[in-house]
Interface confidence: medium
Amino acid sequence: EEELQVIQPDKSVLVAAGETATLRCTATSLIPVGPIQWFRGAGPGRELIYNQKEGHFPRVTTVSDLTKRNNMDFSIRIGNITPADAGTYYCVKFRKGSPDDVEFKSGAGTELSVRAKPSAPVVSGPAARATPQHTVSFTCESHGFSPRDITLKWFKNGNELSDFQTNVDPVGESVSYSIHSTAKVVLTREDVHSQVICEVAHVTLQGDPLRGTANLSETIRVPPTLEVTQQPVRAENQVNVTCQVRKFYPQRLQLTWLENGNVSRTETASTVTENKDGTYNWMSWLLVNVSAHRDDVKLTCQVEHDGQPAVSKSHDLKVSAHPKEQGSNTAAENTGSNER
């Protein structure tokens, strides 16, 4: 009679993470008598996966009933596969011996490869806000996928970005991999409503890529433009001066009025109006009692936006006396200057 052979017909098996792997193994003879064991890896460091004779292997089930006398099918199923299960599995026939069974013959091995989906990409932006025309970096990370081949793309509002660096780690062989990418994005004043998208495509996703997003509203700071104007005189001795604060983001803004360098009033932007591009406008006004001033008045609108150094715009009120009339009249001249 021919000597027993252990046949593992599948050189390789590819299984998705979470699924069950079937590892096939048959013997060509019932002789010699003795158990079958399954190992992952070869040599002294091999890992026992299943022992027909003894032990508890909760994830392993046999395909056929190994208690039947004439059984020669030693195939097993391993449940709930993870990337850590990848490796080469050997079906090994032992011969009954005393006191221990003796290894008789091994199959050629079946390489188990695990396909694991990447985790949802996580996109993170810079810790501090930046202003338009500046370049900021966004990172995208996804983990736990296998095999290594993966495609990552960056988009800003649907337009693909090209300025990015991507690493897949580790560089060598591993049971699963991580991807890390850094993209550079130039901010514009219109980016309050913009989104940066990181898209990851992998064989396990069957053409339906995963996306991670970041809103540029969390990254951008659009500094305000200021305009100080004098409104028509309400009463004979009063002038209404307004400060238009336009196109700023985020909303956090504090405005201080100064008369000849002295603080007159401080207020916080509350009832703002929103522009189509997501920036805000706000107006503050100051009623100046001209009769209280003998000399020209320098009015300054000083704005502190989002904790940044204050910007200001000034307006000179020319105060001149007309002897024909009682009290003092005003001639106002807008000599606004931008001061930082």
């Epitope: 690493n167 780690d169 580790p170 560089v171 060598g172 062989e173 591993s174």
Partner: antibody
């Protein structure tokens, strides 16, 4: 035995290019990566990039991107490293080293090629 | 990029001493860490790969350990030929990076 033989020392002027060769023998050339590492006098080791000799895949260190070109000729079992726009700070010993495909360690090194950049 | 910090930068020891050099990675690199020895005017020589695997032909007085971010190279019973500079190198992520080196000098 496994050996990496590098080309001889070079003296270059700033702005010029240098091309260093690394001839491999004693093993299957296409089964490994070839790394290029440099060492400025009195300083540590600095990885420049690698080429997988089998499929030609290349990875450069961002520091040298745009200035370094790594190639290989499988029939000649030789790897090449070209560095352009040379400056005085590029004066260094340039090593090629055979790389493992799993842990990416460098187990066999060439003797090094001294490149001097001077006007 | 992963930074690799080696310490100490230099040490003085005598023949027969037990010497330990440490290497710390700025993020977890599993066991993708290798150790090299370099003597003046010579190319580096691989001692240990995969954190703890001794390279063929390297004396058993050299040993490596660690995983994640902290690693060490130990030389048991320092020999005259061991006075050299030692470098660790992470091979987890590109750009591959080396530690700054540790010079082992004769006391």
């Amino acid at each position: 035995q496994v050996q990496l033989v590098q080309s001889g020392a070079e003296v270059k002027k700033p702005g010029a290019s240098v091309k260093v060769s690394c001839k491999a023998s004693g093993y299957t050339f296409t089964s490994n990566a070839m790394h290029w590492v440099r060492q400025v006098p009195g300083q540590g080791l600095e990885w420049m990039g690698w080429i997988k000799a089998g499929n030609g895949e290349i990875k450069y260190s961002q520091k040298f991107q745009g200035r370094v070109t790594i190639t290989r000729d499988t029939s000649a079992t030789t790897a090449y490293m070209e560095l352009s726009s040379l400056r005085s700070e590029d004066t260094a010993v340039y090593y090629c080293a055979r790389g493992d495909y799993y842990y990416y360690y460098m187990d066999v090194w060439g003797k090094g090629t001294t490149v001097t950049v001077s006007s | 990029d992963i930074q690799v910090t080696q310490s100490p930068s230099s040490l003085s020891a005598s023949v027969g001493d037990r010497v330990t050099i440490t290497c710390r990675a700025s993020q977890s690199i599993s066991d993708f860490l290798n150790w090299y020895q370099q003597k003046p005017g010579k190319a580096p020589k691989l001692l240990i790969h995969a954190a703890s695997s001794l390279q063929n032909g390297v004396p058993s007085r050299f040993s490596g350990s660690g995983s994640g971010t902290d690693f060490s190279l130990t030389i048991n019973s320092l020999q005259p030929e061991d006075f050299a500079t030692y470098y660790c190198q992470q091979s987890y992520s590109t750009p591959l990076s080396f530690g700054g080196g540790t010079k082992v000098e004769i006391k």
